[in-house]
């Protein structure tokens, strides 16, 4: 017994005075606790505990189940213990078959012995199967067999405690090891959609999927910058042993504009945390916003092609789209398609393909689009650049030479005089009068210019050139003059195209 200083309380003394006692099944167990302040005896084995207020613990006919630790405690809380083995050849093990192990931790197979005097107290695989090569265990006849550093691969491992008796293995009841995995990575979280656009009154529902090795992963939906508890519904599945999936669905049955914001699905385990967000935008009504991809004023050369392209945002989705020119709707030459195949896409593209445009095809081209809530339109003013065309070239009764030309942009008319038979007309002649006339055609059509010069200024035979030009090209008309005495005659005018 331990020695103590006088005056200090000492632990009780037990008879027999040894740490371990082995008795045969059927024999008497008689334990005496001597202490002036005796309180109680306590018996413990596996999860069982019994108490006795008598200072002498007597079990008349010992059974294997009386194997365990007997502890005497005094009023000072000091105690002393003796471990009793009740040797029963018919019951070598006491067993608690529940066996859970946390990955990377040790776990106890609870099969204490009723007789410590045995050989090869070990673990064995069921049905003669070998144990995993890396499995190590520490035997303790009073507690059981400790498996060291449980691995995930040991999950559902079937085991027996075993001893050798007379050359044969005696096995306990079987144990099935259930391994609780350790978290070695953060949870994997994903959301059904990254953004939602709704009208007031519509239902908002979003699902977060959380994946981890076990169901003890924590997850919640949170509204950013808010502490309000959100209503969630859960579904969960175990896909195999260490593949757990939870779906957390957040629902707002009738969304309001002030429900707009960022919602976060947050998950954490002992390794760390992860989150994913989704954005909700609630609008009081639908909308359409159109964005021209080219300038809405378009200049194109005669005979060339042009594509009128718009992008537009439409929510709810567009129901009717059309391109119109001069109150006529195009049935072909245009296409309309979503900007992306994303489920939450609200952006679309519409393209009108105008090919080999003629001078008469300038004007306003309008794109119209509508959905169940709104209509919207955008207009393109298309100007077709045309080379000047000389409409008339005449000598008037008042002696004026007049040239009328049409084209776009507005043509400029220059006059030149070529003396004699020279082909090159270089001497310019200033016009007497220049006017831009109102075209009788549609707007965006050709512009008509009239220019006049006084023919009395010419005293010699020669040719007068009227040259009309703009950015696109030029065209000329010629007046030939011959003098007979004092009379001037106009020989038939003619035009000459100059590229």
């Amino acid at each position: 017994q331990p020695s103590v200083s006088p005056g200090e309380p000492s632990p009780p003394s037990i008879h027999p005075g040894k740490s371990d006692l082995i008795v045969r099944v059927g024999d008497e167990i008689r334990l005496l606790c001597t202490d002036p302040g005796f309180v109680k005896w306590t018996f413990e084995i596996l999860d069982e505990t019994n108490e006795n207020k008598q200072n002498e613990w007597i079990t008349e006919k010992a059974e294997a189940t009386n194997t365990g630790k007997y502890t005497c405690t005094n009023k000072h809380g000091l105690s002393n213990s003796i471990y009793v083995f009740v040797r029963d050849p018919a019951k070598l093990f006491l067993v608690d078959r529940s066996l859970y192990g946390k990955e990377d931790n040790d776990t106890l197979v609870r099969c204490p012995l009723t007789d410590p005097e045995v050989t090869n107290y070990s673990l064995k695989g069921c049905q003669g199967k070998p144990l995993p090569k890396d499995l190590r265990f520490i035997p303790d006849p009073k507690a059981g067999i400790m498996i060291k550093s449980v691995k995930r691969a040991y999950h559902r491992l079937c085991l027996h405690c075993s001893v050798d008796q007379e050359g044969k293995s005696v096995l306990s009841e079987k144990f099935i090891l259930k391994v609780r995995p350790a978290f070695k990575a953060v949870p994997v979280v994903s959301v059904s959609k990254a953004s939602y656009l709704l009208r007031e009154g519509e239902e908002f529902t979003v699902t977060c999927t959380i994946k981890d090795v076990s169901s003890s992963v924590y997850s919640t939906w949170k509204r950013e910058n808010s502490q309000t508890k959100l209503q969630e519904k859960y579904n969960s599945w175990h896909h195999g042993d260490f593949n757990y999936e939870r779906q957390a669905t957040l629902t707002i049955s009738s969304a309001r504009v002030n429900d707009s914001g960022v919602f976060m699905c947050y998950a954490n385990n002992t390794f760390g945390s992860a989150n994913v967000t989704t954005t909700l935008e609630v609008v009081d009504k639908g909308f359409i916003n159109i964005f021209p991809m080219i300038n809405t004023t378009v200049f194109v050369n005669d005979g060339e092609n042009v594509d009128l392209i718009v992008e537009y945002e439409a929510f709810p989705k567009p129901e009717h789209q059309q391109w119109i020119y001069m109150n006529r709707t195009f049935t072909d030459k245009w296409e309309d398609y979503p900007k992306s195949e994303n489920e939450s896409n609200i952006r679309y593209v519409s393209e009108l393909h105008l090919t080999r445009l003629k001078g008469t095809e300038g004007g306003t081209y309008t794109f119209l689009v509508s959905n169940s809530d709104v209509n919207a339109a955008i207009a393109f003013n298309v100007y077709v650049n045309t080379k000047p065309e000389i409409l008339t070239y005449d000598r008037l009764v008042n002696g004026m030479l007049q040239c009328v030309a049409a084209g776009f942009p507005e043509p400029t008319i220059d006059w030149y005089f070529c003396p004699g038979t020279e082909q090159r007309c270089s001497a310019s002649v200033l016009p007497v009068d220049v006017q831009t006339l109102n075209s009788s055609g549609p707007p965006f059509g050709k512009l008509v210019v009239q220019s006049s010069i006084d023919s009395s200024a010419f005293k010699h035979n020669g040719t007068v050139e009227c040259k009309a030009y703009n950015d696109v090209g030029k065209t000329s008309a010629y007046f030939n003059f011959a003098f007979k005495g004092n009379n001037k005659e106009q020989i038939h005018p003619h035009t000459l195209f100059t590229p």
Partner: nanobody, 128 residues
Framework: QVQLVESGGGLVQAGGSLRLSCVAS????????MGWFRQGPGKEREFAAA????????YYADSVKGRFTISRDNAKDTVYLQMNSLKPEDTANYYC?????????????????????WGQGTQVTVSS
């Protein structure tokens, strides 16, 4: 620190007996599991026998079961290996081992990685 010193090795005829002793010093002997490993010529070291700190629970390799007996005397800080019916294949250097928490693997084999202290060894030669 625990020091382990083996003795009792020697030359013996096949079928004969030897008793090996291992004396421990330096720490509480009774807290340690004790055992014997052996290494034959050109072979790896292998487990032979072990006894837990309670002095009652023993372990034997299949190759020595029924022929060898391990025991300990905590009062003398000594562990013994009684070897009977010796065979030429028992020829080896026999090493005493001590571990505070001995780890075993399948078949009740003491995993030598969990040995805390080793002796220098004693030679046993069994002639045919």
């Amino acid at each position: 620190q625990v020091q382990l010193v083996e003795s009792g090795g020697g030359l013996v005829q096949a079928g004969g007996s030897l008793r090996l002793s291992c004396v421990a010093s330096g720490r509480t002997f009774s807290s340690y599991a004790m055992g014997w490993f052996r290494q034959g010529p050109g072979k790896e070291r292998e487990f032979a026998a072990a006894i837990l700190s309670n002095g009652l629970t023993t372990y034997y390799a299949d190759s020595v079961k029924g022929r060898f007996t391990i025991s300990r005397d905590n009062a003398k800080d000594t562990v013994y290996l009684q070897m009977n019916s010796l065979k030429p294949e028992d020829t080896a250097n026999y090493y005493c081992a001590a571990a505070f928490t001995p780890e075993f693997r399948d078949g009740g084999i003491w995993d030598d990685a969990s040995v805390d202290y080793w002796g220098q060894g004693t030679q046993v030669t069994v002639s045919s």
